[in-house]
Amino acid sequence: LRPSRVYKPEGNTKRALTLKDILNGTFSYKTYFPNWISEQEYLHQSEDDNIVFYNIETRESYIILSNSTMKSVNATDYGLSPDRQFVYLESDYSKLWRYSYTATYYIYDLQNGEFVRGYELPRPIQYLCWSPVGSKLAYVYQNNIYLKQRPGDPPFQITYTGRENRIFNGIPDWVYEEEMLATKYALWWSPDGKFLAYVEFNDSDIPIIAYSYYGDGQYPRTINIPYPKAGAKNPVVRVFIVDTTYPHHVGPMEVPVPEMIASSDYYFSWLTWVSSERVCLQWLKRVQNVSVLSICDFREDWHAWECPKNQEHVEESRTGWAGGFFVSTPAFSQDATSYYKIFSDKDGYKHIHYIKDTVENAIQITSGKWEAIYIFRVTQDSLFYSSNEFEGYPGRRNIYRISIGNSPPSKKCVTCHLRKERCQYYTASFSYKAKYYALVCYGPGLPISTLHDGRTDQEIQVLEENKELENSLRNIQLPKVEIKKLKDGGLTFWYKMILPPQFDRSKKYPLLIQVYGGPCSQSVKSVFAVNWITYLASKEGIVIALVDGRGTAFQGDKFLHAVYRKLGVYEVEDQLTAVRKFIEMGFIDEERIAIWGWSYGGYVSSLALASGTGLFKCGIAVAPVSSWEYYASIYSERFMGLPTKDDNLEHYKNSTVMARAEYFRNVDYLLIHGTADDNVHFQNSAQIAKALVNAQVDFQAMWYSDQNHGISSGRSQNHLYTHMTHFLKQCFSLSD
């Protein structure tokens, strides 16, 4: 037996973080996002659950909805109708998948100071929203869409085709929710509330994933989800638009699919209303390197939607897939014809382009060896966007304003110099026409949310500065965080290193690599966090490193598309390269190096452990993908193509974790998975375990009954992190 090694932070009255701190969420931070209801007014839910109205200009504030009203129905969320006459209150939240949930909705009448009783909403509802004007309600119940002209009116049923697990109207099926839309809804009101666009997903021919949910009963339940894995039959999508003024006169009208898309399997990717009678739809070929943006107009004479060929804009990638993780959405100008959009420039960096007529004639608005990330708002004279340009750090986000009214347009960084040390990673929330906006800074210092004037960018007030958190952290020994880059051959890899308090370069420390590494992801970000790895550095004296290898985002397509059609190769290689570089730094104990990851990170950590390099003593994979054939079609095929002989079956087969089972012989491997994982099915870990058993390789495993991909129930999460901590401490010979 090795002597146990105990890390003791030296002579300091401050205490180290404990695992309990992390599990209890003792050091969680707050952000403040105004719920904008006009150009200068917003709502916010106070600490004591009152819904408070604020007017920035008059400095007026009052309770619009009392906590007693919220409490009377156990409401956890709310939504004010645009005419400000009603509020929906959401309760009985019941999570389904990543974004979707069902809930009970109550309508409170602000005019009359009471709940609306006539024609109550059914329960549970899958999605509900107000029209952008007035107080019409659209909602989805049992996979069908309903409309109410006023909350107290009888509902009008718009669709009748809805059927559980077969046809979904106005809400996405599993794969569209997770991999394409990233929302719980698939319906969109026109700006004036006249039209309602929605998608119908037909999953009738999709294979079913079935797994047991054990619950408390004598017999387990079986959960059935239409889930297309790589190469399987996909949902059939159709987009319809209904006139909500006269829904009974003319039924929903189907929007035509562009010919070049409809000729083979395709996806709907997003819908953007341009004006009250103009809509923009985005489509994607199943082989996701061709995207078509189609602008359609309402023809009153035909009572139909027309999408002329000259209003089709094609975006194609020759080096990988179209877009980043998703294809970007357009930000239309006031003229309702031209738009701004982020896509790759000739050098392979994602930048803002202005499209007036054709994509070929697009005017590039931003350029450089960095990337534009998101367009927040386009107004008459300004365009607000975020990028990682400042000082060349890919893991930062600053907000910029381009004055498009000027010729040539001038660019200003709104956030770069505000709180330079504390704030390097921002997002923003704008009022309707950007008269005011809130900045939310996520770090690297303590998060802070501030309110700003949209004309001058002057700070008006601090909305949330996490003073309590600052005070409670005063007596905590936090680790030191460094973000740097390392070079290997012609490649540059950014990494984040979390160093124990009183770190001493002349000493040797155990190293834990935390990896995700999925295409278009980013782990090395300048954000504040107090989590499990912070604890491991603070209390257990472990050096933590996160490395963004090839395939990760915001550093150009050459770096991003390097993994195209060959997942599981360079992501792993680059983690190994980084580990070797860290060893060269001289403070890493080569005998005590571990790697861990979750989901895609579980896949990479498994492959790294099975790389046969002898670099790692041990590692953990939580809910890992083990074969791309087991994962969702939209995701797997985006990066790997199809698992067919004439496409990419060979790499599908040799990129599995199972294919490397023999190589786990000389490492300590902890495999963890939730049995009710709807996303990365338990099947993935079951197959790894089977292969390891067949190869007579010893390993450790833990399953979490009835837990999904997040293993997030309080008890399970506590057990998980405690278990992983014991495993790591044992691996690193750290005493309990």
Partner: antibody, heavy 124, light 113 residues
């Protein structure tokens, strides 16, 4: 004690407008909505509309929409009802009444106190 | 709109006798989630504003004598005055406050026989 005191009787010509006030006292003004109800000779009571003093949002009976305007002055604890384009059939006694705001889901209240009434006569 | 219909239109009753007034609504006033009926009864004397007697169909407003009682559920309701006193001769209105617009019955006049 609770009181709703209305302005005095009015005689108006057809096509004119009338504005009736209702001053509240003896209770917290913002805890109740104010409603307007009229009673034409020999007719049933007819609800015209109401207003929530907390946000000034009015709610009108569709029958009167476009002709009626209900407002509130919270600082004076007073509500107003203005009816325009008067016709002879608008001749009635106009009452204001209070109705408690229902903060809780199980609540819902009747109109428990009424003003003394204002006679509006429309005659050429 | 919910239509409220009272019967009879008028009622002649002797002092000390029982008076029963009926009220029917065109749709149910029973709220399933709290099992309450959103119906009120008012008394109106000449030259005076209406006075609240009963709410929730059967709950007496404070200060209202116990000879007044309300009953019924859903769409059919009754106001009963068990022993008429001289001051009870008036017009009685039912009113629904289940949904907007608020609506009243046409009234029932209780006269001395």
């Amino acid at each position: 004690q609770v009181q709703l005191v209305q302005s005095g009787a009015e005689v108006k010509k057809p096509g004119a407008s009338v504005k009736v006030s209702c001053k509240a006292s003896g209770y917290t003004f913002t805890e109740y909505t104010i409603h307007w109800v009229r009673q034409a000779p020999g007719q049933r009571l007819e609800w015209i509309g109401g207003i929530n003093p907390n946000n000034g949002i009015p709610n009108y009976n569709q029958k009167f929409k476009g002709r009626v305007t209900i407002t509130v002055d919270t600082s004076a604890s007073t509500a107003y009802m203005e009816l325009s384009s008067l016709r002879s059939e608008d001749t009635a006694v106009y009452y204001c009444a209070r109705r408690r705001i229902a903060y809780g889901y199980d609540e819902g209240h009747a109109m428990d106190y009424w003003g003394q009434g204002t006679l509006v006569t429309v005659s050429s | 709109d919910i239509v409220m219909t009272q019967s009879p239109d008028s009622l002649a009753v002797s002092l000390g006798e029982r008076a029963t007034i009926n009220c029917k609504s065109s749709q149910s006033l029973l709220y399933s989630r709290n099992q309450k009926n959103y119906l009120a009864w008012y008394q109106q004397k000449p030259g005076q504003p209406p006075k609240l007697l009963i709410f929730w169909a059967s709950t007496r407003e404070s200060g209202v004598p116990d000879r007044f009682s309300g009953s019924g559920s859903g769409t059919d309701f009754t106001l009963t005055i068990s022993r008429l006193e001289p001051e009870d001769f008036a017009v009685y209105y039912c009113q629904q406050y289940y949904s907007y617009p608020l609506t009243f019955g046409q009234g029932t006049k209780v006269e001395i026989k």
